[in-house]
Interface confidence: medium
């Protein structure tokens, strides 16, 4: 049956799913604060545009009995079945914010009529790609994959003169939700990354990873992993590493590398860190004051989801168009809106575009320095440091295959 929407006559409601299983272990109170801060901004923007309407959020809570681990991989269809019943029995808002787990979003999308937009802070997996009414406000796995292929192929930079075509991927199954789906995408046999690489092997045991570091018979010098520096240290410790090994550490939602007083530990010298360009105004925000750098991105995505809805609502109201139509549901893509921290661009499929930053550890200053940036919107790499003070020979990245190039 068609869901009745509380979305007309000057009153516009946002349904926010506060599910016990979440992409990041974030207290729901912080997400509430982010949503409420977003609502204040939206109301102000609509008022400034001369639109005298009411915008509210309804929070739908789960007490998380079955999801008490907070682990997305425990999310079941049963909870989604229940949510659909609740949604149908009462009035749905104009837009649904949540869930953030790939399994939940995928299942929910399958079982929901495409009559209203879904905005997700998460849903990183490839299975949530190309969904007509789903918008994702945190970088999905597809964007990571495109960067990696672009970087692997690059061979015309002063510090990277070899195309790469091989890689190891370390994936032990204990990853956070974002890392889990990023690495799943790299592991998938049918994916852009796998298609473009000649050799790729997944390392699942700590010992496998540790052995590769000094194995003269290794098939690639490049190892991709996902997590923070502490995660790497737990795995690698102070073990010796062959000088032509390059570890790519994917740590997108972590601003700590850009803080003034941060010094890169010695074990990071063979590592390139892939992260997102940091925001500029978040540190003093009322909703983010108590958040860790990672969780700040998650809460920010909720806030930006509210601002995105406000942006679309304003456009449709100014054009005199109906909100409860398929046109509105399909409109949350191929646009740029004013986010909390500056402009936010969504691609043709409603996925957020961003600037990814590749960092290296300067052997001179022991600081993280920007090597290059990558614009996911145009799939283009921009070198920043043309003469990096690398640990690698001749200040150039080695070939990916042992025995060729700088050793």
């Amino acid at each position: 049956s068609q869901v009745s929407q509380n979305c007309h006559n000057g009153s516009y409601e946002i349904s926010v799913l506060m599910m016990g299983n979440s992409a990041f272990a974030e207290p729901l109170k912080n997400l509430e604060d982010a949503v409420n801060e977003g609502l204040e901004i939206v109301r102000g923007r609509l008022q400034n545009a001369g639109l005298n309407v009411t915008v509210n959020a309804t929070f739908m809570y789960s007490d998380g009995l079955i999801h008490n681990s907070g682990d997305c991989r425990s999310s079941t269809c049963e909870g989604l079945d229940l949510l659909r019943k609740i949604s149908n029995a009462q009035r749905m808002g104009c837009v649904l914010i949540g869930p953030s787990c790939t399994y939940s979003t995928f299942q929910m999308y399958l079982d929901t009529e495409l009559s209203y937009p879904m905005i997700s802070a998460g849903s990183f997996g490839l299975s949530c790609d190309y969904k007509e009414t789903l918008t994702r406000l945190m970088s999905p796995a597809r964007k990571l994959m495109y960067f990696l292929v672009n970087f692997w192929k690059t061979n015309d930079l002063p510090f990277k003169t070899y195309s790469w075509s091989t890689s190891y991927v370390y994936k032990n199954g204990t990853e956070t939700e974002d890392c889990f789906w990023y690495l799943n995408a790299l592991e998938a046999s049918v994916s852009y990354f796998s298609h473009e690489l000649g050799f790729k092997v997944v390392l699942r045991q700590d010992k496998e990873f540790q052995d590769i570091l000094m194995d003269h018979n290794r098939k690639s010098n490049v190892i991709i992993m996902c997590g923070g520096p502490e995660f790497l240290y737990k795995l690698k410790g102070d073990r010796a590493v062959a000088e032509d090994i390059v570890i790519i550490l994917v740590d997108l939602f972590n601003d700590q590398y850009f803080e003034d007083n941060v010094t890169a530990p010695d074990y990071m010298k063979n590592v390139l860190v892939l992260t997102l360009s940091p925001g500029n105004s978040l540190l003093n925000s009322s909703f983010s004051r108590n958040l860790s750098p990672t969780k700040r991105d998650f809460a920010l995505a909720y806030l930006n989801g509210i601002l995105l809805f406000g942006h679309m609502l304003k456009i449709f109201l100014e054009n005199g168009e109906n909100i409860t139509t398929p046109k509105f549901a399909h409109a949350f893509r191929n646009l740029t809106f004013e986010g909390y921290d500056g402009p936010v661009t969504l691609d043709d499929w409603g996925d957020v575009d961003s600037t990814m930053v590749l960092l290296y550890t300067s052997v001179d200053t022991k600081k993280y320095k920007v090597l290059l940036t990558y614009d996911t919107h145009v799939n283009k790499t921009y070198p920043v440091d043309m003469s990096p003070t690398f640990t690698w020979k001749n200040s150039k990245l080695p070939n990916d295959i042992t025995g060729r190039g700088p050793q």
């Epitope: 049956s1 789960s62 007490d63 009995l65 079955i66 999801h67 079941t76 049963e78 909870g79 079945d81 229940l82 659909r84 019943k85 149908n88 029995a89 079982d111």
Partner: nanobody, 119 residues
């Protein structure tokens, strides 16, 4: 469809407690998601709480979160709503609802039980 019968409503002072029950007929009770809704005079029906067939997933409306607790006993074919710290604005007719797993709707509804909270 299952037949549903609510009980346990009544008059209570603000700050007090009540426990509502919803008895269901049929042998496949555990394959039904169950919910509580309420409707105050002149207002729209409001979602209160819901519980999945196994009891593993539970959701609450924001106005009752932290005060009301939903539970079920599949052996007794009964669902419960424990209501604590009641407020005058909780005054309404409370309906229990059921819907089989996999369906998008609560398609069975009880007749309702009146809860009145006086100040």
């Amino acid at each position: 469809q299952v037949q549903l019968q609510e009980s346990g409503g009544g008059l209570v002072q603000a700050g007090g407690s009540l426990r509502l029950s919803c008895a269901a007929s049929g042998r496949t009770f555990s394959s039904y998601a169950m919910g509580w809704f309420r409707q105050a005079p002149g207002k729209e029906r409001e979602f209160v709480a819901a519980i999945s067939g196994s009891g593993g997933s539970i959701y609450y409306g924001d106005s009752v979160k932290g005060r009301f607790t939903i539970s079920r006993d599949n052996a007794k074919n009964t669902m419960y709503l424990q209501m604590n710290r009641l407020k005058p604005e909780d005054t309404a007719v409370y309906y229990c609802a059921a819907g089989p797993l996999g369906s998008p709707d609560f398609d069975s509804w009880g007749q309702g039980t009146q809860v009145t909270v006086s100040s």
